[in-house]
């Protein structure tokens, strides 16, 4: 039985041209996480195992960084980068947990007036 | 250049064990993970598992966990696996192989070792 | 554990043609699939990574496409040099698995 439960930030925004930390977190349950992997829609980001380090998509390399923890770094943000993100959590014995971000991405002017959850 | 060399071929008998080797040169060591791919009838390639160099942690296949063991010498640059309770199942060609930077796809591989269990 | 089903063993082509080879997870992997060709007492040679992107050093007669559950890998004008066998293989989740292998022949 799968007891556990993912926390997200939620839905977020950001500066175009910032950055942003994609962040989930597994609890209420003693599995073990073997490995997440970060998707947006159809397109992988990375993956981390939790023995083999990183995988970072070949396009999101000099965008994405990893970390912190098993979170992920998205950077020099485009309003392209508009949309929803999810962790996939792969863990033993229980199996998959799977979390959602909505990332939208606001012209400076906007990210800086009353912009919920803001990254400077 | 990045090269990976591994030990000559071993004949063994049912029951016994084989430690194969991995020596690395041309990249540091502790920056890639190292991986064990088992071949067998020359086609069917199956994944034995992978070492982290720097820490030493391990991921396997579970096929393989219990009998094989991976371990690195740091100082060398040398990869090994062993594999324990030899069948003639463990018949195969066995190659290192190496990921790319942040990248799982295996770029460097070995020229692979044979092992041919018979008594 | 993740199956890919390559579902050609074999396949004849003639020197010029265009050939695809298909590979299918048994769940999805998102694109976290690569090729990799191997001839005759050779190790396997990354082809393809990140199930669309060429390594360095490939001929762009190679390409390879997919997302998620089915994958192709295409040779656009087959060489004689190609006759090889090739792999896919997911790393998407450990164990990390490889197709059956199609062996390419030419005619």
């Known amino acids: 039985m799968m007891t556990g439960t993912i926390e997200t930030t939620g839905n977020i925004s950001a500066e175009k041209g910032g950055s942003i930390i994609l962040q989930c977190h597994l609890s209420s349950t003693t599995a073990q996480v073997t490995q997440v992997a970060w998707e947006q829609q159809d397109q992988l980001l990375a993956i981390c195992n939790a023995d083999l380090g990183w995988h970072i998509s070949p396009s999101f390399k000099d965008r994405v960084a990893p970390g912190p923890g098993l979170g992920l770094t998205l950077q020099s943000l485009t309003v392209n980068d508009t949309g929803e993100y999810f962790c996939i959590y792969h863990t033993y014995p229980d199996g998959t947990y799977t979390g959602r971000i909505f990332l939208e991405v606001l012209e400076s002017s906007v990210a800086e007036h009353g912009a919920r959850f803001q990254i400077p | 250049e990045v090269q990976l060399q591994q030990s000559g071929p071993e004949l063994v008998k049912p029951g016994a064990s084989v430690k194969i080797s991995c020596k690395t040169s041309?990249?540091?060591?502790?920056?890639?993970?190292m991986h064990w791919v088992k071949q067998s009838h020359g086609k069917n390639l199956e994944w034995i598992g992978g070492?982290?160099?720097?820490?030493?942690?391990?991921s396997y296949n579970q096929k393989f966990k219990g009998r094989a063991t991976l371990t690195v010498d740091k100082s060398s640059s040398t990869a090994y696996m062993e594999l324990r309770s030899l069948t003639s199942d463990d018949s195969a060609v066995y190659y290192c192989?190496?990921?790319?930077?942040?990248?799982?796809?295996?770029?460097?591989w070995g020229q692979g070792t044979s092992v041919t269990v018979s008594s | 554990d993740i199956v890919m089903t390559q579902s050609h063993k074999f396949m004849s082509t003639s020197v010029g043609d265009r050939v695809n080879i298909t590979c299918k997870a048994s769940q999805g992997v998102s694109t976290a699939v690569a090729w990799y060709q191997q001839k005759p007492g050779q190790s396997p040679k990354l082809l393809i990574y990140s199930a669309s992107y060429r390594y360095t050093g490939v001929p762009d007669r190679f390409t390879g496409s997919g997302s998620g559950t089915d994958f192709t890998f295409t040779i656009s004008s087959v060489q004689a040099e190609d006759l090889a066998v090739y792999h896919c293989?997911?790393?998407?989740?450990?164990?990390?698995?490889f197709g059956g292998g199609t062996k390419l022949e030419i005619k």
């Open positions: 293989q997911q790393h998407y989740i450990t164990p990390w698995t």
């Open positions: 192989a190496r990921p790319g930077w942040y990248n799982y796809a295996m770029d460097y």
């Open positions: 070492i982290n160099p720097n820490n030493g942690g391990t």
């Open positions: 041309g990249y540091t060591f502790t920056e890639y993970t």
